[in-house]
């Protein structure tokens, strides 16, 4: 057979359909690859073949089109199975060609089994809700073209194993689910089963999303940074370890990039030659609020590190902060002697236990690794 | 270790009302359902409806809509079971039971009660 | 509803013999069954779930099978603890509906 331009396997669409439902899948050579649709390739005399490979063989075939009930048939650029079956799964080929012309690619399609909550191997995607912030709504995904408008199909939503009726704050309305006020209480998963006729037949779609209950906008503010703060002051003799952690919290905020960064001297601590080490954490609260930790240390401080500014800086969307951490370095304590012996020196042992560093207006002194949360 | 703890034993006169408790201790953060189930002295098991308490959700068995109703008080963590109009067929064994989430199938009646013995007669 | 039939009612076997009990659905449930075990006086306990699966704690010597309206418990060498009652419940379907138990006594 004559060249063919081949884009191999397209990973990037792993395709999941549940066993025993309708599918329609269309060829991704008209979605990602060529920069016409099947409309202008069919006029200009292309035609559209399919074939597939199945799961654990290496063998190309053509798929059978002459099955009972026309249960896999191809419409335009689409692939239908009216319904799936598990043996469906395998790596699927559409190849446009005429005598001139070929081009290819192959995407896996993988049937997949549900049970009677739902739970299954597919991916789910996942719908953001605002916390407390008013009527928001969801809707069935991934349904459009399964059947004409004329259609009336019945739609019924789930919770995992429970029908959605009688809820608080959740109201089915067709295609959509409205959360008249979202709580925690409503993340999860949530199903709706579109069930429509076709020819004598009876169709079910299954369609599972996770439903995740975020921070409200309406609460949101620019990042707080806890510390460094004006209470702690890092104070330090040469050749100490200095640790400084930088603690900021950021409201959630959708697709917002939340940005922590020192600086010492005003510039990047990679540009400053000094062997510091910076170490990220990051933790979520259950609105997805996020605290990042960021520590900046210097192994052995030299008196010329202890003279430069330490600044924290933190970036949202919501705007941007700094905070100078007050380092500072410890004057030798006077060594107090008593005569005659016997007494030991209590404000030498005052000022040892005083190590790390001074809460100011307090007078307790902390360890660094209680910052460090 | 969660339980479920059930209201003492019920002696009703046909017509009236009971009204069982189910405390459940250990509860889990993320919703779950508590249903309801009876068995009549030598019968089998019947399911009777459920609640998931933190969402408000319920539904009954056909049998007893209009009958039975099923509350929940989320800040005692305490479902509730009532059956009105009864008669002496009602006179049964009644159990709350629950899963851990409510996306477990076939795990929804993990963690059973000791049962609620109603005696309905006059 | 679907309707949920068990057999045999009763079924004696001496202990270290093997129990076989049946359970049989109106319709199709595919593997949506889950099997319970009843002492008099207690409540149910589940044992069995999505056909074939043990719930924590339930001794090996108890297995399901089956998928569809046909599924079978197995007590593969039955102790003295063993002999109760023990129910079938479909949960493919809402209402989710029990079978009538089939009782095990000790013969």
């Known amino acids: 057979s004559e060249r063919c331009d081949d884009w191999g396997l397209d990973t990037m669409r792993q395709i999941q359909v549940f066993e025993d439902e309708p599918a329609r899948i269309k060829c991704p050579l008209f979605e990602h690859f060529l920069k016409f649709n099947y409309s202008t390739a069919h006029s200009a005399g292309l035609t559209l073949i399919w074939y597939w490979t199945r799961q654990d063989r290496d063998l190309e075939e053509p798929i059978n089109f002459r099955l009972p009930e026309n249960r896999i048939s191809k419409e335009k650029d689409v692939l239908w199975f009216r319904p799936t079956l598990l043996n469906d799964t395998g790596n699927y080929t559409c190849m446009l060609r005429n005598t001139t012309y070929c081009s290819k690619v192959a995407f896996p399609l993988e049937v997949v089994q549900k049970d009677s909550c739902f739970n299954s191997p597919m991916k789910l995607p996942v719908h953001k809700l605002y916390i407390e912030y008013g009527i928001q709504r969801i809707t069935c995904p991934n349904v459009d073209g399964y059947f004409p408008s004329s259609v009336k199909p019945t739609i019924t939503w789930y919770m995992g194993c429970y029908k959605i009726q009688n809820f608080n704050n959740v109201i089915p309305e067709g295609m959509n689910l409205s959360f008249l006020i979202a709580f925690i209480s409503n993340n999860g998963n949530y199903t709706c089963v579109v069930t429509y006729p076709e020819n004598g037949r009876t169709f079910h779609l299954t369609r599972t999303l996770t439903v995740k209950v975020v921070g409200s906008p309406k609460n949101a503010v620019p990042p707080v940074i806890h510390s460094p703060n004006d209470h702690v002051v890092y104070e330090k003799e040469p050749g100490e370890e200095l640790l400084i952690p930088c603690t900021v919290y950021f409201s959630f905020l959708m697709d917002s990039r939340n940005e922590v960064w020192w600086t010492i001297d005003g510039k990047k601590p990679d540009d400053i030659p000094i062997d510091v080490t910076i170490n990220e954490s990051i933790s979520h609260s259950r609105t997805e609020d996020e605290t990042r930790t960021q520590i900046l240390s210097i192994k052995k401080v030299t008196s010329e590190d202890l003279k430069r500014s330490y600044v924290c800086h933190a970036r949202s969307a919501k705007g941007e902060v700094a905070k100078a951490a007050t380092v500072k370095q410890k004057v030798p304590a006077p060594r107090y002697t008593v005569e005659g012996g016997g007494g030991t020196g209590g404000l030498n042992d005052i000022f040892e236990a005083q190590k790390i560093e001074w809460h100011e207006g307090g007078g307790h002194h902390h360890h660094h690794h209680h910052h460090h949360h | 270790q969660v339980q479920l703890v059930q209201s003492g034993a019920e002696v009703k006169k046909p017509g009236s009302s009971v009204k069982v408790s189910c405390k459940a201790s250990g509860s889990p953060a993320e919703p779950y359902a508590i249903q309801w189930v009876r068995q009549a002295p030598g019968q089998g098991l019947e399911w009777m409806g459920y609640i998931i308490p933190s969402l408000g959700g319920y539904d009954y068995a056909q049998k007893f809509q209009g009958r039975v109703t099923i509350t929940a008080d989320e800040s005692t963590s305490t479902a509730y079971m009532e059956l009105s109009s009864l008669r002496s067929e009602d006179t049964a064994v009644y159990y709350c039971?629950?899963?851990?989430?409510?996306?477990?199938?076939?795990?929804?009646?993990?963690?059973w009660g000791q049962g609620t013995l109603v005696t309905v007669s006059s | 509803e679907i309707v949920m039939t068990q057999s045999p009612a009763t079924l004696s076997v001496s202990p270290g013999e093997r129990a076989t009990l049946s359970c049989r659905a109106s319709q199709s449930v595919s593997s949506n069954l889950a099997w319970y075990q009843q002492k008099p006086g207690q409540a149910p306990r589940l044992l069995i779930y999505g056909a074939s699966t043990r719930a924590t704690g339930i001794p090996a010597r108890f297995s399901g099978s089956g998928s569809g309206t046909e599924f079978t418990l197995t007590i593969s060498s039955l102790q003295s603890e063993d002999f109760a009652v023990y129910y079938c419940?479909?949960?493919?379907?809402?209402?989710?509906?029990f079978g009538q138990g089939t009782k095990v006594e000790i013969k």
């Open positions: 039971a629950r899963g851990q989430t409510l996306y477990a199938a076939g795990r929804q009646f993990d963690i």
């Open positions: 419940q479909q949960y493919n379907n809402w209402p989710w509906t």
